[in-house]
Interface confidence: medium
């Protein structure tokens, strides 16, 4: 059901039909669900070809990236957004997510965060989840607005299952990982638990359900006694170095 499909807490309206149906032009990737990309006639868009990672919102990108159209004015209907490198101090910005960690957007410029006068919970944009009555989105803007968490979430470290933006929002022993339509605090993996080995940095973006990384002193390796037909589907577990 593509009506009202959500991406990391954001609703995307007026999606083109999946799998290259009418309106789905080849090359115009639309992220229908966290990690599920429909592009042209291909069922999946993988990262093996080293293309930029398409996104619909900042949370789908790494902590040192933000989501935007590669060229100004290209983010209208059908325009593809990708993860771009964050902007350093004193660079131009339009929102906090564009600035690199430790900075925030003030008067259009990335400035160092001064937590003494700018509490963490207020660093995010003040447009807290207003998609429900966002007329622009309903009018056919194919991409969601950035959503943020209420500031109270930042005052105490998130417990297992609570919504987060990044791992530092979570209590000790937890990381922030994608789950359902948002990101939540999940337990860091223990020895013997199944882990996900990524082919390259950033490929975790294709997972609807992200696992945390392996705990201290552990590495994600192929389970030695796990034999399967294809190498690509071998089970990885957290193992001692």
């Amino acid at each position: 059901t593509l009506n009202s499909v959500l991406i990391n807490s954001n609703a995307i309206k007026n999606l083109p039909p999946p799998l290259g149906g009418a309106g789905g032009q080849p090359g115009s990737a639309v992220s229908v669900a966290p990690g599920v990309l429909y592009e042209g006639g291909n069922k999946y868009q993988t990262l093996d070809n080293y293309q930029p990672y398409p996104c619909a919102e900042d949370e789908e990108c790494g902590s040192d990236e933000y989501c935007s159209s590669p060229s100004r004015g290209a983010a209208g209907v059908g325009g593809v957004q990708i993860c771009l490198a964050c902007r350093k101090r004193r660079k131009r910005c339009m929102r906090h997510a564009m600035c690199c960690p430790g900075n925030y957007c003030k008067n259009g410029i990335c400035m160092p965060s001064d937590h003494s006068h700018f509490p963490r919970g207020e660093i995010e944009e003040s447009i807290i989840e207003n998609l429900g009555n966002d007329h622009n989105a309903a009018a056919g803007d194919g991409y969601p607005r950035r959503t943020t968490l209420t500031s109270k979430i930042y005052h105490t470290k998130g417990q297992e299952g609570s919504v987060c933006l990044r791992s530092s929002d979570c209590a000790a022993g937890l990381c922030c990982a994608r789950h359902f339509w948002s990101k939540i605090c999940k337990p860091v993996l223990k020895e013997g638990q199944v882990c996900t080995k990524h082919k390259r940095k950033g490929s975790h973006g294709l997972e609807i359900f992200q696992r945390c990384y392996c705990g201290e002193g552990l590495a994600c390796r192929i389970q030695k006694d796990h034999h399967q037909a294809s190498n690509s589907s071998r089970l990885h577990t957290c193992q001692r170095h």
Epitope: L6, A33, F209
Partner: antibody, heavy 116, light 111 residues
Framework: QVQLVESGGGLVQPGGSLRLSCAAS????????MSWVRQAPGKGLEWVSG????????HYADSVKGRFTISRDNSKNTLYLQMNSLRAEDTAVYYC?????????WGQGTLVTVSS | DIALTQPASVSGSPGQSITISCTGT?????????VSWYQQHPGKAPKLMIH???NRPSGVSNRFSGSKSGNTASLTISGLQAEDEADYYC??????????FGGGTKLTVLG
Amino acid sequence: QVQLVESGGGLVQPGGSLRLSCAASGFTFSSYWMSWVRQAPGKGLEWVSGISYSGSNTHYADSVKGRFTISRDNSKNTLYLQMNSLRAEDTAVYYCARMGIDLDYWGQGTLVTVSS
Amino acid sequence: DIALTQPASVSGSPGQSITISCTGTSSDVGGFNYVSWYQQHPGKAPKLMIHDGSNRPSGVSNRFSGSKSGNTASLTISGLQAEDEADYYCSTWDMTVDFVFGGGTKLTVLG
């Protein structure tokens, strides 16, 4: 401890309306997505609807789309399900569930019977 | 509609091990590598037993374990006990971000 208590179920005629409530306690309600799941008598579980932590984003199963509306009031720690144009096939026990690591906590359910 | 297929019933004697299977398609169980399992006693609410295919929430006995191979997920209960008698449901998400449950399996503990 986490507690979810549903209320508002009952007998209603086909085409009628009903509003279910789910009172949450024991956790920071506004930090979690919430869901409704139903179970027809003697049948399996069917996911009905989900709502984001602030309430602005909602998602529905095809079977209830356009008839049911999920909402929440974080100031009251309460989840709602407004059910309109009810049909006989909507007869079920309706559970509210917290969407943490999966549907990690469930209420005891409230029975909705649609019959003439 | 995407469906997850479970056996209608499974039985075992106390102390034995039993396995409940959950078969899906590449767009749900196989594609996402993510399955959860719920236990439901008669007249009670479901309880999460396994998430992420094989992880147990705190408070769940280590007699319960989950695994996945291809498009089939499995729940294994070792050292079967009388209180394990219940209905068990697998669930996952399909490509359209719908939450999908299996039809359920009734576990009977013999004797």
